[in-house]
Interface confidence: medium
């Protein structure tokens, strides 16, 4: 038994990365800890060193192979253990039977670009990164646009319920600076969550009339 409350959460990016966060109230300080991944039916195992991200939480990334290699499938179950050094021994602090395709969090979309911009609308495209071919078209997206004088949290969410890697933003204000972000989520997986938001794409709508100063 471990003193304090422990939480061990991991997500699979659908290709070759499992990211984990371990939180432990009253956890031992200055102790070396790692996450060990042991698949149920594969010839490899992997470890990563847990590094502190706050007073009582640590994180690490299990790199399973080349970024676009399909290292796990829907059938795999990976036993994940948090091991902390106790003298000359390793002590198991947390354990979970990890089903990768039930715990998905994809990489943030990349390569955002303005395809076409007008006074009141802007067409933007993006690409998904390191997403498994298993999903086929079973992905959804959320997008948000940052308007002047507002925060990201205030921005309304636009939902795309299909694999659509573009959006046409309407009813924009002419000659105005905006920022745009998008995130992706597979439809599969009981504990699947949204990817991080993409890097913001800044764009400016065209002026309303020719000759107007920008």
């Amino acid at each position: 038994a471990v003193n304090g409350t422990s939480q061990f959460t991991c997500f699979y990016n659908s290709r070759a990365n499992i990211s984990c966060v371990w939180s432990q109230d009253g956890a031992l300080q200055d102790t070396s800890c790692q996450v060990h991944a042991w698949p149920d039916r594969r010839r490899w195992n992997q470890t990563c060193e847990l590094l502190p991200v706050s007073q009582a939480s640590w994180a690490c990334n299990l790199i399973l192979g080349a970024p676009d290699s399909q290292k796990l499938t829907t059938v795999d179950i990976v036993t994940l253990r948090v091991l902390c050094r106790e003298g000359v021994r390793w002590r198991v602090m947390a354990i979970q039977d990890f089903k990768p395709f039930e715990n998905l969090r994809l990489m943030a979309p990349i390569s955002l670009q303005v395809v076409h911009v007008e006074t009141h609308r802007c067409n933007i495209s993006w690409e998904i990164s390191q997403a498994s071919h298993y999903f086929e078209r079973h992905l959804e997206f959320e997008a948000r646009t940052l308007s002047p004088g507002h925060t990201w949290e205030e921005a309304p969410l636009l939902t795309l319920k299909q694999k659509q890697e573009w959006i046409c933003l309407e009813t924009l204000t002419p000659d105005t600076q905006y920022e745009f972000q998008v995130r992706v989520k597979p439809l599969q997986g009981e504990f699947t969550t949204w990817s991080p938001w993409s890097q913001p794409l800044a764009f400016r709508t065209k002026p309303a009339a020719l000759g107007k100063d920008t």
Partner: antibody, heavy 119, light 106 residues
Framework: EVQLLESGGGLVQPGGSLRLSCAAS????????VHWIRQAPGKGLEWLGA???????QYNAAVKGRFTISRDNSKNTLYLQMNSLRAEDTAVYYC?????????????WGQGTLVTVSS | DIQMTQSPSSLSASVGDRVTITCQAS?????LYWYQQRPGKAPRLLIY???NLASGVPSRFSGSGSGTSYTFTISSLQPEDIATYYC?????????FGQGTKVEIK
Amino acid sequence: EVQLLESGGGLVQPGGSLRLSCAASGFSVTSYGVHWIRQAPGKGLEWLGAIWSGGSTQYNAAVKGRFTISRDNSKNTLYLQMNSLRAEDTAVYYCARAGDANYDGFAYWGQGTLVTVSS
Amino acid sequence: DIQMTQSPSSLSASVGDRVTITCQASQSVSFLYWYQQRPGKAPRLLIYDTSNLASGVPSRFSGSGSGTSYTFTISSLQPEDIATYYCQQWSTYPLTFGQGTKVEIK
């Protein structure tokens, strides 16, 4: 040496219950997933479910709700609890473990235990 | 569930013959296994991941295939090979087996 030994089979009436045991030796049940597979007389093999090293379970929908897989870590033993038994549950029941890091598939099998459901 | 269909369901061959069994999956599978089951015994793993020979298995046994179509071959049938052979997929749950192919000696 990895060994699996099933026990607990026998004759049971329809609607009855039975608990099968699978005693493991040569490895720890907290380090490997163990599966239950059955074979009706003169028929093929049917996967029933598994208990993984962390203790979570997975079932074939055909038996989910009636069959429960559990384990006792201190005894290094797995169990298959079977409720609401039917004539079609008559079979030899095997526990099996996948291989180690050198190869996959069900490399280790018990000898099986016969369950007969009949009035 | 993925259905695994083996053919033939039974065959009779002479010692030294080349024996081939096919396994057809109802949808594409990534990992295929072959087992041998002698009468009254538990199954024995012969082939893992489609084509790899399990530990201690004679080299006369082999496997091949991909997608939905797989083949198991005994290059030179021996008397001790009398058994029923099963294919099994481990690409999605529930894990499923073929119905078996009974191999006899003429």
